[in-house]
């Protein structure tokens, strides 16, 4: 015979399982029984804490029976069949249903052996991030929209971004009982430089495999920001043509170019192209300052260059000459 | 209350066979489990094997199998215990026993008064 | 074959306390054995008091009480009675049959 206390019969299940919200879920319990242990199981009962009676018995003479029987079913058990298996099906899982489950057999000679299980209702969350078009404010405003609707619980948003920033999240009750809708917003003080830069935000939801990433593509309108390239200081009567560049960073881009001169309209030697100005060469000294005004949507700003053409040797440096 | 009542004693020869029962009352006789035990004449007690009253499902000492058979009739709530092939060492006081429920635990609450069977040439 | 061994005899005063003990040949007794405890009086049927090691059958007096106690089960009645005066019967579950005790017989005096 074998020692006393090799083994007792176990009843075996998850801590806890987790269902979506209007779909069916199982919960899983078994009766573990060591090699030569003889036990005989007379009743399955599924009963929830905190309720008076029980929510599904299986008899072992007397079947099924169910305190909503559309809505509850034993998988495994069957009449004249050994009762192991009290894995219980609930269809149409409600936020309600969320809690505790005691599995219980009765066997015999062993005595009642339960085991307890939680139920978690979860609800996939749908997520969407989208972009706050901002201007120039000079103070924090959201910058980018992230939002997990009807999630259970509700789903983790976090941001992440090389630009710092500050988040802002709230919940709000969703379309289904029970859910929650949570809105995040990633604050900053809007600047050119954060334009078209990324950010993502991250949901994190007990219903994902792994963390959803959304990208949000940045956008800040701001006015012209100019300068004024191609000019190196060295230019000398004699040398070729040059081209002076109006290079403007705008959202959105320039609608226009416009150049001129502090002394009012451009003199001959200077053309523009756009962007461009042409400076065709001069045969004698020239100290101007041109000015380059470009405009947008939201404005407008220019940017001044003092151009001087000086008389000296051609041939050792860059700059304007006759051909 | 709950009472069982044993049939009266028996007096058997040598390789006869003995059918004793136990009659239930006071309780729902088929979600029971029934014991059978004996006592010979200056020995201990000795299980003999149980039945479970709903189904008829049961469990024999490995010493009596193929000898012994347990049945229940649940329209009289009486449970039967044949001990066939009887020999001297047979000779006991048989006892029906029902099993009850103690919070989670099962323990021998109820017994028969007892049954005398005899093996003698 | 499993042996259950209890002491032949034991004598308590009333209003004493005693543990009658049960032990087995196959090693310490535990939880699995489901030890059940039953009274025999003198001329009278039967009676289960404990059940799966230490619970007292319903109408059991509370000066009945079960237990592991080392390696044995135990059966201790604290404020004996005269009525008490009985044979007491160990039966040990081994995985597929149950063994009874020799049976211990208790004096009250």
């Known amino acids: 015979w074998p020692p006393p206390g090799t083994g007792d019969v176990v009843v075996q299940a998850p801590t806890q399982v987790p269902g979506f919200l209007g779909d069916s879920v199982t919960l899983p319990c078994y009766l573990q029984v060591p090699n030569m242990e003889v036990t005989h199981v007379s009743q399955l009962t599924w009963a929830r804490h905190g309720e008076s009676g029980s929510m599904a018995v299986f008899h072992q003479t007397q079947g099924p029976s169910y305190s909503e029987s559309k809505r509850l079913e034993f998988v495994a058990a069957r009449l004249g069949a050994e009762l192991r298996n009290a894995s219980l099906r609930m269809f149409g899982l409600r936020v309600e249903d969320e809690g505790n489950y005691t599995c219980l057999f009765v066997t015999f000679p062993q005595g009642s052996r339960s085991v307890d299980i939680w139920l978690r209702v979860l609800a996939k969350p749908q997520n969407t991030a989208e972009v706050q078009k901002v201007q120039l404010t000079g103070e924090p405003v959201p910058m980018a929209r992230c939002v997990s609707t009807g999630g259970r619980p509700p789903a983790q948003i976090t941001w992440h971004s090389d630009l710092g920033g500050m988040p802002n999240t709230s919940q709000v009750p969703g379309f289904l009982s029970g859910t929650v809708t949570v809105t995040s917003l990633w604050i900053l003080v809007p600047s050119s430089q954060v334009d078209g830069k990324n950010v993502t935000c991250k949901v994190e939801h007990e219903s994902f495999e792994k963390p959803q990433l959304l990208t949000v593509n940045l956008t800040v309108y701001y006015p012209p920001e100019v300068s004024i390239s191609g000019y190196d200081n060295n230019w000398y009567l004699g040398q070729n043509e040059a081209t002076l560049t109006c290079d403007a960073r705008s959202n959105p881009e320039p609608t226009g170019y416009n150049w001129s001169t502090t002394m009012g309209p451009l003199p001959p030697f200077a053309v523009a192209q756009g962007a461009q100005l042409l400076i065709r060469p001069v045969d004698k000294p020239i100290n101007t300052t041109l000015i380059c005004n470009v405009t947008n949507a939201l404005g407008a700003r220019q940017a001044e260059l003092t151009v001087q053409v000086k008389e000296g040797p051609p041939s050792e440096h860059s700059g304007i000459s006759r051909n | 209350q709950v009472q069982l009542v044993q049939s009266g004693a028996e007096v058997k020869k040598p390789g006869a066979s003995v059918k004793v029962s136990c009659k239930a009352s006071?309780?729902?006789?088929?979600?029971?489990?029934i014991s059978w035990v004996r006592q010979a004449p200056g020995q201990g007690l000795e299980w003999i094997a149980w039945?479970?009253?709903?189904?008829?499902?049961?469990n024999y000492n490995q010493k009596f199998t193929g000898r012994v058979t347990m049945t229940t009739d649940t329209s009289t709530s009486t449970a039967y215990m044949e001990l066939r092939s009887l020999r001297s060492d047979d000779t006991a006081v048989y006892y029906c026993a029902r099993h009850g429920l103690t919070g989670r635990h099962w323990y021998f609450a109820v017994w028969g008064q007892g049954t005398t069977v005899t093996v003698s040439s | 074959q499993a042996v259950v061994t209890q002491e032949p005899s034991l004598t308590v005063s009333p209003g004493g306390t005693v543990t009658l003990t049960c032990r087995s040949s196959?090693?310490?007794?535990?939880?699995?054995?489901?030890a059940n405890w039953v009274q025999q009086k003198p001329g009278q049927a039967f009676r289960g008091l404990i059940g799966?090691?230490?619970n007292r059958g319903p109408g059991v007096p509370a000066r009945f009480s079960g237990s592991l106690l080392g390696d044995k089960a135990a059966l201790t009645l604290s404020g004996a009675q005269p009525e008490d005066e009985a044979e007491y019967y160990c039966i040990l579950w081994y995985s597929n049959k149950f063994v009874f005790g020799g049976g211990t017989k208790l004096t009250v005096l």
């Open positions: 006071g309780y729902t006789f088929t979600s029971s489990y």
């Open positions: 039945i479970y009253a709903g189904t008829g499902d049961t």
């Open positions: 196959t090693g310490a007794v535990t939880t699995s054995n489901i």
């Open positions: 799966g090691t230490n």
